[in-house]
Amino acid sequence: QPPPPPPDATCHQVRSFFQRLQPGLKWVPETPVPGSDLQVCLPKGPTCCSRKMEEKYQLTARLNMEQLLQSASMELKFLIIQNAAVFQEAFEIVVRHAKNYTNAMFKNNYPSLTPQAFEFVGEFFTDVSLYILGSDINVDDMVNELFDSLFPVIYTQLMNPGLPDSALDINECLRGARRDLKVFGNFPKLIMTQVSKSLQVTRIFLQALNLGIEVINTTDHLKFSKDCGRMLTRMWYCSYCQGLMMVKPCGGYCNVVMQGCMAGVVEIDKYWREYILSLEELVNGMYRIYDMENVLLGLFSTIHDSIQYVQKNAGKLTTTIGKLCAHSQQRQYR
Amino acid sequence: SAYYPEDLFIDKKVLKVAHVEHEETLSSRRRELIQKLKSFISFYSALPGYICSHSPVAENDTLCWNGQELVERYSQKAARNGMKNQFNLHELKMKGPEPVVSQIIDKLKHINQLLRTMSVPKGRVLDKNLDEEGFESGDCGDDEDECIGGSGDGMMKVKNQLRFLAELAYDLDVDDVPGNNQQATPKDNEISTFHN
């Protein structure tokens, strides 16, 4: 059956609506026209739309779609952005406290090792922070550097305090001896394992959250195709050309159109689901040595234990190092 | 044994945080985030439906627009694309995702792979064989995890983890998001270009 004639044979209602979209009336016909030049709202009879109006409707339809998409993702976007910021800051605070705990341990138990120990501890935790934020640093290197740097100070200040401060040559020998003689036992390796596991997990957790933001931002700012624009225009605006201002699109029709427009976006679904489930699995495993909070805040204690281990074996070590580094020590006393 | 007197806190504001018993730890905050994220697990598959429900669609009206004509809401014509001869929806779907979408899918695949490899194997949280040689006497037990915090009575208990810090206690409840009152849907007031 032919559509009912426009209730207003003068296109007055259409004009007053269109004026809100586009001030200036020159695009709206005074009275219904054949509309043979229309490409989207193909008329079955006289129409109150012109080609220019149709273009404006298409533009508006695509804009509406973008706004709807942004509104749809707002809650999710806020959730991830806020949490990414919170966790990043929380991790930095944990690192800061871990550094403070470790410095305090040195100050209380080994005051003669400060301020050198403070410097090494500070550098170590700087690398921890940088690693979490994605820097290409090797955890084993930073743990090795910590113990390599600490041992000469421990030896010259705690175990053999008679050596002069200027004993630079013996430092070279002591650094080498640290690993050769395993002076800290298995503690460096233990710390490497705990720190690398907990930091790796922390780093990937932050990376995953930041990628989540990127995913939402990408789909949030999609530009819809011309074909989609036409479909949306026909669904939302073509009825106006017939003067049907109060009519709304059918629900099923809307779903079909949206699925067409969002076919590409919906392809993300499978990987998005997997992303959330994989992230859940990761989070479920973030405890004990996979929990940086637990590992880093306990590090001062493990370092303390490692120094106690050196002290426990001091007699044996001093004799061995005395022989091993004899040449260096003699040079110092000349 | 090592001890940690509180007067040595370099960052004083932490003092009031470290002993708050009822604040969340980071791990509980992580789990809370996952629970909230899981409510968005169908976000992308549900998008078309979400957008339809938040844009003008005939709900209580008898008649609705099918792209070409006015039809009864429950008729077969209501779900059909009124101008199916003009644009092929199947063709639109066959075009495949935009390059930016393909790129983001690749990134998601990559992070998913990383997350899977990083996920802790079930049943065992740690590697038993830390080193070929066993610990010497006086070292930790063979479970490397036991090495955390074993230095005597005065030791700060690591189990009492850093509480989720006061300065970070943003309220993450989404109800408080500015402009995110779920009752005020775009259908009602957000998209000014719809005039019904």
């Epitope: 550098e123 700087t126 640093i137 090795n144 740097s149 080498g176 | -």
Partner: antibody, heavy 120, light 112 residues
């Protein structure tokens, strides 16, 4: 005392690779990193890369595809290799020991330098 | 990359004079950890560079106390209180706050 001695050819053709060996004494490669730097009249001093005590390496991003640094701890030797050298790679190449903390360190002892001319 | 600019290019002095060399970086060398990784080297004629000062103001082992370093952020200075003959050569500043490490173009200290 700490010493770094360099050896390598002075003249290299673009088709060959540029290889220099740095032999160290007075310290162990298992506890110190070794950097490579070059100096040319046109570019001044330019940091090329480093090999750490663990064997891990860091390179200058501009040259990463052409550089390789390896070492033999037991022989106290570090090996620097640059593939497809060009004329503007002609320079004096230095190895130097890392002092300070890893990549935030400095070179506290330097080799004597190897003058390299790339010419066809 | 961080660009290090040294002034002057050449500094003619008489022995016993004070000398001052300036080094400016294109971005701040203050690391997020509070340290500044700015170092000074001296290269005598026909020799390899030698470390003089590390982290702005710390003299390396064996370096005489007539050498002092100062500055912060992007502006740094090396001072020699009384120039001696062995101090002649080219002075380089270098930074390791940012990767890659970069060096200044050098300042040649020579006799007037």
């Amino acid at each position: 005392q700490v010493q770094l001695k360099q050896s390598g050819p002075g003249l290299v053709q673009p088709s060959q690779s540029l290889s220099i060996t740095c032999t160290v004494s007075g310290f162990s490669l298992t506890s110190y990193g070794v950097h490579w730097v070059r100096q040319s009249p046109g570019k001044g001093l330019e940091w090329l890369g480093v090999i750490w005590s663990s064997g891990n390496t860091d390179y200058n991003a501009v040259l990463i595809s052409r550089l390789s640094i390896k070492k033999d701890d037991s022989k106290s030797q570090v090996f620097f290799k640059m593939n497809s050298p060009q004329v503007d790679d002609s320079a004096i190449y230095y190895c130097g020991r890392n002092g300070g903390w890893l990549l935030r360190g400095f070179m506290d002892f330097w080799g004597q330098g190897t003058s390299v001319t790339v010419s066809s | 990359d961080v660009v290090m600019t040294q002034t002057p290019l050449s500094l003619p002095v008489s022995l016993g004079d004070q000398a001052s060399i300036s080094c400016r970086s294109s971005q701040s060398l203050l690391h997020s950890n509070g340290n500044t990784y700015l170092h000074w080297y001296l290269q005598r004629s026909g020799q390899s560079p030698n470390l003089l000062i590390y982290k702005v103001s710390n003299r390396f082992s064996g370096v005489p106390d007539r050498f002092s370093g100062g500055g912060s952020g992007t502006d740094f200075t090396l001072k020699i209180s009384r120039v001696e003959a062995e101090d002649l050569g080219i002075y380089f500043c270098s930074q390791s706050t940012h990767v890659p490490w970069t060096f200044g173009g050098g300042t040649k200290l020579e006799i007037k």
